[in-house]
């Protein structure tokens, strides 16, 4: 960052998107700012316009190509700059040499579906989205289940330490509404972080069978 009050954070989704957030205390209002990407070994440059997400925070997505195209590799370094317009000139507000595969955040898992549901258990599957083939099987997942009367923050985390795109939830209560979420993280990258949580999947366990009269 150019000064101590500025923070510039970016993540690569492993395919064709670098998402950036720039925060600055007392930043200029009504000023046009851009993120500019300058790869060290590619023939393209890319910009995106920073849009406000809060009073002192701006965000944008550098869309490098079609969603599933592999635009960067582990050896790439991309110089990322925040530039803001000052009159007819552009001023560099922040800069970083970005190593994409050290700063990964994948897209949230998609296509969640109930494969099989019973009274006390439910089998759920999902898919990963726009994840690089470089990872092979080197991914991990976290999942959580929302029970009635609780919040997501109270839900215990279930960890899957391998690329396993399904889970069997057990010890559930019969005839009860639940919600389920999952997120993914590559094992690679010093500053890699968890993906956003998936959209919640709602499901209901089957009612318990009625006992026979004695």
């Amino acid at each position: 960052a150019v000064n101590g009050t500025s923070q510039f954070t970016c993540f690569y989704n492993s395919r064709a998107n670098i998402s950036c957030v720039w925060s600055q205390d007392g930043a200029l209002q009504d000023t046009s700012c851009q993120v500019h990407a300058w790869p060290d070994r590619r023939r393209w440059n890319q910009t995106c316009e920073l849009l406000p997400v809060s009073q002192a925070s701006w965000a944008c997505n550098l869309i490098l190509g079609a969603p599933d195209s592999q635009k960067l590799t582990t050896v790439d370094i991309v110089t990322l700059r925040v530039l803001c317009r000052e009159g007819v000139r552009w001023r560099v507000m922040a800069i970083q040499d970005f190593k994409p595969f050290e700063n990964l955040r994948l897209m949230a898992p998609i296509s969640l579906q109930v494969v099989h549901v019973e009274t006390h258990r439910c089998n759920i599957s999902w898919e990963i989205s726009q994840a690089s083939h470089y990872f092979e099987r080197h991914l991990e997942f976290e999942a959580r289940t929302l029970s009635p009367g609780h919040t997501w923050e109270e839900a215990p985390l279930l960890t899957l330490k391998q690329k396993q795109e399904w889970i069997c939830l057990e010890t559930l209560t019969p005839d009860t509404q639940y919600e389920f979420q999952v997120r993914v993280k590559p094992l690679q990258g010093e500053f890699t972080t968890w993906s956003p949580w998936s959209q919640p999947l709602a499901f209901r366990t089957k009612p318990a069978a009625l006992g026979k009269d004695t």
Epitope: H36, T47, C48, W90
Partner: nanobody, 123 residues
Framework: EVQLVESGGGLVQAGGSLRLSCAAS????????MAWFRQAPGKEREFVAS????????DYVDSVKGRFTVSRDNAKNTVYLQMNNLKPEDTAVYYC????????????????WGQGTQVTVSS
């Protein structure tokens, strides 16, 4: 790479209006800063207006400020140039241009171009 097709040109009297459209295909439209340029007979191609990926920020050559408005519809992969109060000196072939780098959009050699649409303003 993106492909661009302009439409909406024609013959109009001075003081009239035209709306040019540029339809993009072949790549992710929101990757691109879009611009309009024009080239009058015997003159260099010149920058007219540009619009950033989000559509929030626009830029114009001084001679069209207050008369022309550039906009984009990312859902329709289209950029527009609304031209009001047209003058005979606006007569030119108008070209749509695209560049992934906002800071290169005014450089003629770095852009992807459409084939152009003729605008003629009679007095």
């Amino acid at each position: 790479e993106v492909q661009l097709v302009e439409s909406g040109g024609g013959l109009v009297q001075a003081g009239g209006s035209l709306r040019l459209s540029c339809a993009a295909s072949g790549d992710v439209f929101v990757r691109y800063t879009m611009a309009w340029f024009r080239q009058a007979p015997g003159k260099e191609r010149e920058f007219v207006a540009s619009v950033t990926d989000s559509g929030r920020t626009t830029d114009y050559v001084d001679s069209v400020k207050g008369r022309f408005t550039v906009s984009r519809d990312n859902a329709k992969n289209t950029v527009y140039l609304q031209m009001n109060n047209l003058k005979p000196e606006d007569t030119a072939v108008y070209y749509c241009a695209a560049n992934t780098d906002y800071f290169q959009i005014k450089s003629l050699d770095r852009n992807t171009w459409g084939q152009g649409t003729q605008v003629t303003v009679s007095s």
